[in-house]
Amino acid sequence: EAHKSEIAHRYNDLGEQHFKGLVLIAFSQYLQKCSYDEHAKLVQEVTDFAKTCVADESAANCDKSLHTLFGDKLCAIPNLRENYGELADCCTKQEPERNECFLQHKDDNPSLPPFERPEAEAMCTSFKENPTTFMGHYLHEVARRHPYFYAPELLYYAEQYNEILTQCCAEADKESCLTPKLDGVKEKALVSSVRQRMKCSSMQKFGERAFKAWAVARLSQTFPNADFAEITKLATDLTKVNKECCHGDLLECADDRAELAKYMCENQATISSKLQTCCDKPLLKKAHCLSEVEHDTMPADLPAIAADFVEDQEVCKNYAEAKDVFLGTFLYEYSRRHPDYSVSLLLRLAKKYEATLEKCCAEANPPACYGTVLAEFQPLVEEPKNLVKTNCDLYEKLGEYGFQNAILVRYTQKAPQVSTPTLVEAARNLGRVGTKCCTLPEDQRLPCVEDYLSAILNRVCLLHEKTPVSEHVTKCCSGSLVERRPCFSALTVDETYVPKEFKAETFTFHSDICTLPEKEKQIKKQTALAELVKHKPKATAEQLKTVMDDFAQFLDTCCKAADKDTCFSTEGPNLVTRCKDALA
């Protein structure tokens, strides 16, 4: 229903705390370089204005759209052009073009320093002094680094953060209480970020139809007892929520997500038997819980899919007269039978089915032509199953760090032109799939592995889009989202690449590496490994292992030496020589 004042409506629906949090996230995601204090000032002004509109919806400017109100605020920031360059040109446009312009200037890889966690004591002091400001800083820092983070989920993670600090800051050993808990939240939030970015990419590149297909598959797997109309309703609502968040309409997004959670909890009987635990929780926890609720038990008496989609005489009539609905029904039926498949695989199968009907329904005897379609799915199913088996076996053999290194070598060979930091980041993220998925029960591995890899590869594509350097990567990133992972997996050594010259300084290290945290040490070593592969793309695994073992031994020796600096300056050049010889 239409409201006289959109901002008053959203303020009333969301409440002051969530309203302020969402406005802060929105501003931080649009203007990623501004300080917390600058954004906090704007948020307060917007909130005060919203309150005047709640008091009197007819007050001046209260009838303006949220894009107009927020855009006007952002465009009034002093020194916009000096700080943001051409983004300032957006302010010469009218809505809705102005908002589109802001969206196009969101930076997936902003040049901001990594978000460093303060010492436990310092954190607890500032949290106790002003919890609201402390959480505001958290929202701001995460949102500006992740401009497509799913805003209502970010509020959930902030709430988790708050609860952890409240609990741990009361303990004697704050550090050992905080570190594992905050690491856990950070890991989950980073995964949430890449998953959401993938959803926004799907929406931006292929439109609502593509996202809705993703949602139908995912929801059908989770709620196999819900009928198609129920799944369609949920998919339509979920598409709207994600479209709003991806489009920067964060207040509408959070409000609609709360509505969707309410609807699901009021209609558990027709959706799933597994929702009650989630529905007993408060709003943010409830919506989060519903988004990752376990799959309902599959109905025992599901008929063979062939009856509806191969054996029926009306297949071509349904395809011709109601294409999207028919394919949607197919996707629903196939997905509810296969919680053990990835959504990407299910979408590939639906695409294969569509292509088969497109071809067969134009022939003289369609049933004879499409009669074998389900058998033709077999190779499409086997490929990711083999990928999971091979990679999980390798992970179990090498552990996470070794597995990351194997992936780093593989991907540097596939796309050696890509910058080393991007390759290292990608390999580290791709390598985490082992820890995340390979320990799961057999029937959960494939969906976990493939859908996670797809999300990470989407980030590779986004970073590569900014500065395209590899034809291999461009080729895989240009196709459909669901074909990306198989495309990357199928890439081999790039034969067009001219190996990089060997530069001694690339492999020269200093004693400061000894004091780095383990993660940073690993990144340094992985950077060297990528550079080695760029120098010798066809080096064997054995040669690379020899060099890396030597390198690890060198670090271990020098970091234990009494005079570290001397050790690094004398042993370093020897290491470089041995590396060159080993790779010759």
Epitope: A229, V325, T329
Partner: nanobody, 126 residues
């Protein structure tokens, strides 16, 4: 829960007409395809006609094409089967059936339809 209730059956002379109705209760009935089946004494249930839900698409068995017309009135949650040029071989109990939330008739196999009305008898005889 889906509930279906047929009415409109009766005795009619060959060449005559009848209109069957099926009143449906289900939240998504307007998005659900509904089918008419019939069962003559001693025979299997057979598909007669169907209509899409939220999709303008109709389906007919070859034996009734051109004689029977299926339609729906979503404002009344009611499905109709207009039967013209009736023949003695059309004598049967007529049932309406639904697969909840399915907008298309993707199969004419009676076993795949979980919800049925109690049926209405149509007798074509002189």
């Amino acid at each position: 829960e889906v509930q279906l209730l047929e009415s409109g059956g009766g005795l009619v002379q060959p060449g005559g007409s009848l209109r069957l109705s099926c009143a449906a209760s289900y939240r998504y009935i307007d998005e659900t395809a509904v089918a008419w089946f019939r069962q003559a004494p001693g025979k299997e249930r057979e598909f007669v006609a169907g209509i899409g839900g939220g999709v303008d698409i109709t389906y007919y068995a070859d034996s009734v094409k051109g004689r029977f017309t299926i339609s729906r009135d979503n404002s009344k949650n009611t499905l109709y089967l207009q039967m013209n040029s009736l023949r003695p071989e059309d004598t049967a109990v007529y049932y309406c059936a639904a697969r909840p939330g399915r907008p298309l008739i993707t199969s004419k196999v009676a076993d795949l339809y979980p919800y049925w009305g109690q049926g209405t008898l149509v007798t074509v005889s002189s």
